[in-house]
Amino acid sequence: QGWQAFKNDATEIIPELGEYPEPPPELENNKTMNRAENGGRPPHHPFETKDVSEYSCRELHFTRYVTDGPCRSAKPVTELVCSGQCGPARLLPNAIGRGKWWRPSGPDFRCIPDRYRAQRVQLLCPGGEAPRARKVRLVASCKCKRLTRFHNQSELKDFGTEAARPQKGRKPRPRARSAKANQAELENAY
């Protein structure tokens, strides 16, 4: 199968990063570099821009069968890959002539999974083995979230006004998750 998968300790089945579909061409309505408006330079405050498209995640979808060893789901599933820039790149030259780049300290905006959907799938196995049920967690939506360097890694902040709104039907997550576990989840996300 083209979509190999591995299991992590949360028993999610996550496609290999190398198998993600190619993102579509970059959006062409980036106004921050418009010479008439900004003299060809980015504005002083990179996050004070009216162009909402700069802050949106791209939600690319893909289709796959869930596999577990030789077993494969009876029905395929579809989920999202979170992609795209959350705000201007804010990359500055590190040193003259070095050609290296660095990101200034401050809020780091990432396009990561926002909402998951738990889905029960039936796995069919070869050799007359009985089918077995399995629950998988599929990415259902993406969001730009702010990762503040000065706070614990696990403190991901929602970007935009939606942060204040509690989500319906969702229990508050225990805060005691280790930063290490959370970092692994972030790395899986993009």
């Epitope: 939600e59 979808h61 395929p76 579809t78 889905q119 259902a140």
Partner: nanobody, 118 residues
Framework: EVQLVESGGGLVQAGGSLRLSCAAS????????MGWFRQAPGKVREEVGS????????YYADSVKGRFTISRDNAKNTMYLQMNSLKPEDTGVYYC???????????WGQGTQVTVSS
């Protein structure tokens, strides 16, 4: 439930083209994504590609990239599969299916036969 009906299958020579259609009716608002799948004789059903209805973002399996194109017509509630440079290994029954994002493809059409002769 979404009702799906495929059409456009047939016999074609290797290197030829074919265009399949999948017309959706019923609770079409309950689907985010529509996909094409195929099943060759004696093989398991495999994904061909899919399209996200809201923004027409497409996904293709490696085996068909560059040869097959998926599109949709909102007004007609129809998805298309344009198949070019067909190969004998593209032979099989082609199915269309619908799903919500983060879920399984629960609604399926009856399928249309595509045969590519060498």
């Amino acid at each position: 439930e979404v009702q799906l009906v495929e059409s456009g299958g047939g016999l074609v020579q290797a290197g030829g083209s074919l265009r399949l259609s999948c017309a959706a009716s019923g609770r079409t608002f309950s689907r985010d994504v529509m996909g094409w799948f195929r099943q060759a004789p004696g093989k398991v059903r495999e994904e061909v590609g899919s399209i996200k209805w809201s923004d027409a973002n497409t996904y293709y399996a490696d085996s068909v990239k560059g040869r097959f194109t998926i599109s949709r017509d909102n007004a007609k509630n129809t998805m298309y599969l344009q198949m070019n440079s067909l190969k004998p290994e593209d032979t099989g029954v082609y199915y269309c299916a619908a799903a919500i994002i983060g879920g399984t493809y629960n609604d399926w059409g009856q399928g249309t036969q595509v045969t590519v002769s060498s």
